[in-house]
């Protein structure tokens, strides 16, 4: 028979107030015959937590049937954990003897400490939108965790980021800790549908990290590109001019037409479409009456996007004599 080993697999056990803690202890041999006891602490002042042989321990239950000779699992559960329960717990084998049992071997001990889960990470983006190719900062905060050791990672669309700084406070001993991390993210034109994720891993989470997210759509402004074109076909005495506003975000947009510098009040037809990347296209049609027009008509499509300075595109209308004749012919 191999020499008895007392196995306490966890060096550290984090528990939550009010919950039940399981302290594991297994033996590698059924010899020598004798009881297993649990103590908190070492030396003469150690506190008896459980004695399989005798005594009343209302908060302690055993994981397996300790009355059986062939039992090798001496794990216990302690219910209704309080801060007073913290300490190092030892599983100790005794050899049957008289007048008292003789201590034979102790396990290495399991430190029980109070653990607190971190709060769900909150990710905050920049206060103002920024255009692609620029860098924006996101902050992630999580609070109330213990112990202090914690891992925080940043991801953009599943790809881990490396440009971030993290602080855990306070630096000294505390009941609970907070983490704050700031990541720098370079915006891409297609980031309207992108997400940044802050992932927090802590021992209390048992391998299931907490995540906080922020949508880059809240941080990005993709400015539009403008194109004004004259349609080759005319309708009666009118020429159709199109202003195409492409690839912009957010949707907030004001478009105005001007004829030779005069803002036109009349309504125009328009359509808004959403692109796969989350940006928008806006197409506006402007009908110009050419029957009484001179040759030098200049149309301007002016766009004010998301409160930014207006951008505009001009088009000098081409109206041939033939077109004029046609239009006057068509006029009743």
């Amino acid at each position: 028979e191999e020499e008895l080993q007392m196995i306490q697999p966890e060096k550290l056990l984090l528990v939550t107030v009010g919950k039940t803690a399981t302290l594991h202890c297994t033996v590698t041999s059924l010899l020598p015959v004798g009881p297993v006891l649990w103590f908190r602490g070492v030396g003469p002042g150690r506190e008896l937590i459980y004695n399989q042989k005798e005594g009343h321990f209302p908060r302690v239950t055993t994981v397996s049937d300790l009355t059986k000779r062939n039992n090798m699992d001496f794990s216990i559960r302690i219910s209704s954990i309080t801060p007073a329960d913290v300490g190092t717990y030892y599983c100790v084998k005794f050899r049957k003897g008289s007048p008292e049992d003789v201590e034979f071997k102790s396990g290495p001990g399991t430190e029980m400490a109070l653990g607190a889960k971190p709060s769900a990470p909150v990710v905050l983006g920049p206060a103002a939108r920024t255009t692609p190719e620029h860098t924006v900062s996101f902050t992630c905060e999580s609070h109330g965790f213990s112990p202090r050791d914690i891992t925080l990672k940043w991801f953009k669309n599943g790809n881990e980021l490396s440009d971030f700084q993290t602080n855990v406070d306070p630096t000294g001993q505390s009941v609970a800790y907070s983490i704050r991390s700031t990541a720098r993210v370079v915006l891409d034109p297609w980031d309207v549908r992108s997400q940044v994720i802050c992932e927090v891993a802590h021992v209390t989470l048992q391998g299931d990290p907490l995540r906080g997210t922020a949508n880059l759509s809240e941080a990005i402004r993709v400015p539009p590109t403008l194109e004004v074109t004259q349609q080759p076909m005319r309708v009666g005495n009118q020429v159709n001019v199109t202003c195409q506003v492409r690839k912009f975000y957010p949707q907030s947009l004001q478009l105005t037409w001007s004829e030779n510098g005069n803002v036109c009040q009349r309504e125009t037809a328009s359509t808004l479409t959403e692109n796969k990347d989350g940006t928008y296209n806006w197409t506006s049609w402007f009908l110009v009456n050419i029957s009484d027009q001179r040759d030098d008509v200049v149309l301007t499509c002016q766009v004010k996007h998301d409160g930014q300075l207006a951008v505009s595109k001009r088009l000098a209308l081409e109206v041939t004599v033939h077109q004029k004749d046609q239009s006057s012919d068509a006029t009743p």
Epitope: L30, V33, E54, R69, K96, S98, P99
Partner: antibody, heavy 118, light 107 residues
Framework: EVQLVESGGGLVQPGGSLRLSCAAS????????MHWVRQATGKGLEWVSV???????YYPGSVKGRFTISRENAKNSLYLQMNSLRVGDTAVYYC????????????WGQGTMVTVSS | DIQMTQSPSSLSASIGDKVTITCRAS??????LAWFQQKPGKAPKSLIY???SLQSGVPSKFSGSGSGTDFTLTISSLQPEDFATYYC?????????FGQGTKLEIK
């Protein structure tokens, strides 16, 4: 069902030999210490021998050197080889399992009678 | 060897009585003491181990106490099936030894 069944008892002359068997079932035989206990007619119980899970054996002075306890875990069997039998060895022989954590007996067989007489 | 002495050797009692049997060890045996019940022609039955722990399936009318050298077995309310011979046994060290028995008879 946990069970112990002894066999091999009978009538033997003084100086003779006998081998008792105990068939175990319903539990992991190799994980328990096993004992023999005897009881002469109208008398009290007397512990005869033990074989531990590691094969270690112990006997009282009254049978030491004459009796040998052994076990065959693969067959879930316990044996007691009794040599140089005396009239005073006449008794019902029980096998018992040291089934409690502290090796207290928890299960007993029904017993087998050994009579040593000329 | 450790000597175990039971008293009384025999005891008469009536149905419903509470009876106590004592067992004394010749030296300290901690609390490694067991109690057994035996009926005529039958194998012993385990009742109590570690002085006060009830074996599985044993009714709670049986109780044990004691530590060191002096131990007791108490049967709280005698029923017809309880009339038998009772043995104590020390199992702190080899050779394990039994008391001489206490015969509990119906009055």
């Amino acid at each position: 069902e946990v069970q112990l069944v002894e066999s091999g008892g009978g009538l033997v002359q003084p100086g003779g030999s006998l081998r008792l068997s105990c068939a175990a079932s319903g539990f992991t035989f190799s994980s328990y210490d096993m004992h023999w206990v005897r009881q002469a007619t109208g008398k009290g119980l007397e512990w005869v021998s033990v074989i531990g899970i590691a094969g270690d054996t112990y006997y009282p002075g009254s049978v030491k050197g004459r009796f040998t306890i052994s076990r065959e875990n693969a067959k879930n069997s316990l044996y007691l080889q009794m040599n140089s039998l005396r009239v005073g060895d006449t008794a019902v022989y029980y096998c018992a399992r040291g089934g409690s954590w502290d090796d207290a007996f928890d299960i007993w067989g029904q017993g087998t009678m050994v009579t040593v007489s000329s | 060897d450790i000597q175990m002495t039971q008293s009384p050797s025999s005891l008469s009692a009536s149905i419903g009585d509470k009876v106590t049997i004592t067992c004394r060890a010749s030296q300290d045996i901690n609390n490694y003491l067991a109690w057994f019940q035996q009926k005529p022609g039958k194998a012993p039955k385990s009742l109590i181990y570690t002085a006060s722990s009830l074996q599985s399936g044993v009714p709670s009318k049986f109780s044990g106490s004691g530590s060191g050298t002096d131990f007791t077995l108490t049967i709280s309310s005698l029923q017809p099936e309880d009339f038998a011979t009772y043995y104590c046994q020390q199992y702190v060290s080899y050779p394990y030894t039994f008391g001489q028995g206490t015969k509990l008879e119906i009055k």
